[in-house]
């Protein structure tokens, strides 16, 4: 798979490829990876995609399921580089706080918080 | 600032508090702190408390913005609970599918994506 | 393609008001600031200020602020920028521009809006 | 407000000419400066920004450089499309400033 392809078209594939292969994925019936227990995903990619390792060493390879852990590995790549771009640029504190208020804001309307 | 204080709360009245104290926060015009290219905030929430870390060194303390200060680290140790979620429950495979495919399924429609 | 599309030209009496649209397509409208500029004739270019669609947080330049105002609807994938007490100065064609990233460079820009304040 | 000097406010080339513009921060600005490039009549276009970083599709000619106070743009080898009026503009502190512009006209 090119990683030309965008990201947004490499998510719409895998979720696709996930329905397809689910009764393959699920054979292993003694397997047991984390889940995280909230819907906040971002904060638990890390654990998400230690657990797509877990899985996929307990998969029997071959065909699409391939391309399944491939477009797995290109969205895990994609979340590194965003991760990147947290630190890379030093910005006056202006820009921090307009930033810190856009993310307080997100917190406040989307996050699932439990109190 | 009682813990007890539902989260939620707690980022409304940081955001009122963040509004307030503008003025002092950015006296400082040579700090500079990284600010995220992206708008996908839960990627980037060690390099945001880092920041908030930075700008209350360097920010002259007492009254309401002791408060701010107080609140963000209130939210930080939300998070940090948050975080510590991710990983602690281990479940079928079944269950984690279901996680992965609601990840990706909010990465495609609600993150911010740059091909 | 990602575009951003203004209204067109306008006519104003001093003292009045003026709204100049900006439409977003080809891209998703909220993960981007919208800057405004304006351009006096044969003159510079000047930043009015931006607007955060995502959380409708909007700064201005101190110059403009009080008679500025930024807004966006999310619906229809559209900022505005209102202009009030016009007066023969504000005589200038009006840019939004979409910001990359966070406070960063203006990568596409809108075609531009003339707006002429005469008596 | 961080004022943006820019120099030469107008300058006559040829075809083939190697050409420089200055632009001058009144403070650090660090490398928040981007370069946009405007023909009469037409909407204003960036081509460079963080200083040095040139923008998909604009041609390798267009070079820029310089960080804190002193940044320049060069075109290499002017291009008859490329006879338009050029300004800096900080992004480092809001307002965001811009330079009063370069005119590049036909020698």
């Known amino acids: 798979i090119p990683t030309e392809i965008p990201t947004s078209a490499l998510v719409k594939e895998t979720l696709a490829l996930l329905s397809t292969h689910r009764t393959l994925l699920i054979a292993n019936e003694t397997l047991r990876i984390p889940v995280p227990v909230h819907k906040n995903h971002q904060l638990c990619t890390e654990e998400i995609f230690q657990g797509i390792g877990t899985l996929e060493s307990q998969t029997v390879q071959g065909g699409t399921v391939e391309r399944l852990f491939k477009n797995l590995s290109l969205i895990k790549k994609y979340i590194d580089g965003q991760k990147k771009k947290c630190g890379e640029e030093r910005r006056r504190v202006n820009q921090f706080l307009d930033y810190l208020q856009a993310f307080l804001g997100v917190m406040n309307t989307e996050w699932i918080i439990e109190s | 600032i009682p813990t007890e204080i539902p989260t939620s709360a707690l980022v409304k009245e940081t955001l009122a508090l963040l509004s307030t104290h503008r003025t002092l926060l950015i006296a400082n015009e040579t700090l500079r702190i990284p600010v995220p290219v992206h708008k996908n905030h839960q990627l980037c929430t060690e390099e945001i408390f880092q920041g908030i870390g930075t700008l209350e060194s360097q920010t002259v303390q007492g009254g309401t913005v002791e408060r701010l200060f107080k609140n963000l680290s209130l939210i930080k140790k939300y998070i940090d609970g948050q975080k510590k979620k991710c990983g602690e429950e281990r479940r079928r495979v079944n269950q984690f599918l279901d996680y992965l495919q609601a990840f990706l399924g909010v990465m495609n429609t609600e993150w911010i994506i740059e091909s | 393609q990602v575009q951003l599309v203004q209204s067109g030209a306008e006519v104003k009496k001093p003292g009045a008001s003026v709204k100049v649209s900006c439409k977003a397509s080809?891209?998703?409208?909220?993960?981007?600031?919208i800057n405004w500029v304006r351009q006096a004739p044969g003159q510079g270019l000047e930043w009015i200020g931006y607007?955060?669609?995502?959380?409708?947080?909007?700064r201005y330049n101190q110059k403009f602020k009080g008679r500025a105002t930024l807004t966006v609807d999310k619906s229809t994938s559209t900022a505005y920028m209102e202009l009030s007490s016009l007066r023969s100065e504000d005589t200038a064609v009006y840019y939004c521009?979409?910001?990359?990233?966070?406070?960063?460079?203006?990568?596409?820009w809108g075609q531009g809006t003339l707006v002429t304040v005469s008596s | 407000d961080i004022q943006m000097t820019q120099s030469p406010s107008s300058l006559s080339a040829s075809v083939g000419d190697r050409v420089t513009i200055t632009c001058k921060a009144s403070?650090?600005?660090?490398?928040?400066l981007s370069w946009i490039q405007q023909k009469p009549g037409k909407a204003p276009k960036t081509l460079i920004h963080?200083?040095?970083r040139l923008i998909d599709g604009v041609p390798s000619r267009f070079s820029g450089s310089g960080s804190g106070q002193d940044f320049t743009l060069t075109i290499s080898s002017l291009q008859p499309e490329d006879f338009a009026t050029y300004y800096c503009?900080?992004?480092?502190?809001?307002?965001?400033?811009f330079g009063q512009g370069t005119k590049v006209e036909i020698k």
């Open positions: 607007i955060n669609p995502y959380n409708d947080y909007s």
């Open positions: 963080r200083a040095d």
């Open positions: 403070q650090d600005i660090n490398s928040y």
């Open positions: 521009a979409r910001d990359y990233g966070n406070f960063w460079y203006f990568d596409v």
């Open positions: 080809g891209y998703t409208f909220t993960n981007h600031h």
């Open positions: 503009l900080q992004y480092d502190d809001f307002p965001y400033t």
